[in-house]
């Protein structure tokens, strides 16, 4: 696993401990909480980061209305079970034997049950809608400048391939970033949209996961873009399965 060899640190994940005892005597960085070695040349999976922390059509200018099947992460933080590759296990349980199924970004997609609950597969989140509200500014941002800056951010800071940023919508003060990545589109080495969205979310909150970098300084044509609210919606390849009781609540 690559890391900054000279001083053995992990540029993409500060929630690690690094030492020169990896294969071939190379620097190896282990995620806090799980102890799994991480690849410091790319983003760390959201599952390992969570564990460490506890331990619309492309050119449309209108805002997207999240579908009825869109999930919002209302459950907050939990200590997840990750598979040997660092992905979320389909079934998550807490210490009181309450279990539930999650999607590939770790968001609950079923009612909670007991240890008999079955989650046959990890359902992929293929569409993420990041809904931002920016602080008041003298005037609206130029949409194409804003679009370009956010695409640059995801490409350069989060190493997300540009084809996965499906659209950037803007109706002052609301900005929406759409990320799309089907199972068939994601090649080996591609950053997962769920991981990119999580890094972005933490950056926006002023909790950057990057080692030694300053916080996120978003500017559009020199004008600071300051976010005051963030909502993230997750759409899965297979719709979630909640009881009617929850849907009407």
């Amino acid at each position: 696993h690559t890391a900054a060899q000279d001083n053995c640190t992990c540029p993409t994940n500060k929630m690690t401990v690094c030492s020169p005892d990896g294969p071939g005597g190379r620097c190896q960085c282990r995620a806090l909480g799980s102890g799994m070695a991480v690849d410091c040349s790319t983003l760390t999976s959201k599952c390992l980061l969570l564990k460490a922390r506890m331990s619309a059509p492309k050119n449309a200018r209108t805002l997207v209305r999240p579908s009825e099947h869109a999930l919002v992460d209302n459950d907050g933080l939990y200590d997840p079970d990750c598979d040997p590759e660092g992905r979320f296990k389909a079934r998550q349980c807490n210490q009181t034997s309450v279990c539930w199924c999650v999607n590939s970004v770790g968001v609950r997609r079923t009612d909670k049950g007991d240890l008999s609950l079955r989650c046959d597969e990890l359902v992929r989140t293929h569409h993420i809608l990041i809904d931002l509200r920016h602080r008041p500014t003298a005037g609206a941002f130029n949409h194409s400048d804003l679009d370009a800056e956010l695409r640059r951010l995801f490409r350069e800071r989060y190493r997300l391939h540009p084809k996965f940023v499906a659209a950037v919508h803007y109706e002052q003060p609301t900005i929406q970033i759409e990320l799309r990545q089907n199972t068939s589109q994601k090649a080996a080495g591609d950053v997962d949209i769920g991981d990119a969205a999580y890094y972005f979310e933490r950056d926006i909150k002023g909790e950057s996961l990057f080692q030694g970098r300053g916080g996120l300084d978003l500017r559009v044509r020199g004008e600071p873009l300051q976010v005051e609210r963030t909502l993230i919606y997750y759409l899965d390849e297979i719709p979630p399965k909640f009881s009617m009781k929850r849907l009407t609540a």
Partner: antibody, heavy 115, light 107 residues
Framework: QVQLVQSGAEVKKPGASVKVSCKAS????????IHWVRQAPGQGLEWIGT????????VYNQKFRDRATMTADTSISTAYIELSRLRSDDTAVYYC????????WGQGTTVTVSS | EIVLTQSPATLSLSPGERATLSCRAS??????IHWFQQKPGGAPRLLIK???ESISGIPSRFSGSGSGTDFTLTISSLEPEDFAVYYC?????????FGQGTKLEIK
């Protein structure tokens, strides 16, 4: 050359505590994990936990989380493990070892728990 | 936690013969497996790291192979001093664990 030198044998009564030290030399103490492993008489090897000396980040085997405490003093390149509320089945040889693949080991410290 | 299962528990061979020791992991651990030799009254000694990387000072008759869940330690031609207990250990994630050991004895 790399060396890990452990403190001497200990005899303790049930319920007491024991603290074993491991003095490192011949390498940069702060940049390598120190692991603690024990071996009961006639048994296999059991991982107790590990500590990263530079920031004292410690990880424990669940089995020992309530009773073991690992610390490190970087000023004298020494790691410690303290085991409390000793029981007779804690009788074992306790080893410290370096790095994720345990390339260097201490000579072992025999801890006997007997009333 | 990851469980390492070593086989056989005991292996009886003669000097000069080839020894093949197995270690199976309960889940994919890549190449994060290490092999140790332990003689009575002594500390374990590292023989192979990361499944197949050789260790300075260890005779070339010791070699390792495998990845994922199945790993092998091979001693190409046994010397009298090789009769000991052998352990595998993983460093994939916490907690690290050891196999239960394989005792290599003289036939």
């Amino acid at each position: 050359q790399v060396q890990l030198v452990q403190s001497g044998a200990e005899v303790k009564k049930p319920g007491a505590s024991v603290k074993v030290s491991c003095k490192a030399s011949g390498y940069s103490f702060t940049t390598h994990w120190i692991h603690w492993v024990r071996q009961a008489p006639g048994q296999g090897l059991e991982w107790i936990g590990t500590i990263f000396p530079s920031n004292a980040y410690a990880v424990y085997n669940q089995k020992f989380r309530d009773r073991a405490t690992m610390t490190a003093d970087t000023s004298i390149s020494t790691a410690y493990i303290e085991l409390s509320r000793l029981r007779s089945d804690d009788t074992a040889v306790y080893y410290c070892a370096r790095a994720s693949y345990f390339d260097y080991w201490g000579q072992g410290t025999t801890v006997t728990v007997s009333s | 936690e990851i469980v390492l299962t070593q086989s056989p528990a005991t292996l009886s061979l003669s000097p000069g013969e080839r020894a093949t020791l197995s270690c199976r992991a309960s889940q994919n651990i890549g190449t994060s497996i290490h092999w140790f030799q332990q003689k009575p009254g002594g500390a374990p000694r590292l023989l192979i790291k990361y499944a197949s990387e050789s260790i300075s000072g260890i005779p070339s008759r010791f070699s390792g192979s495998g990845s994922g869940t199945d790993f092998t330690l091979t001693i190409s031609s046994l010397e009298p001093e090789d009769f000991a207990v052998y352990y595998c250990q993983h460093s994939h994630s916490w907690p690290f664990t050891f196999g239960q050991g394989t005792k290599l004895e003289i036939k």
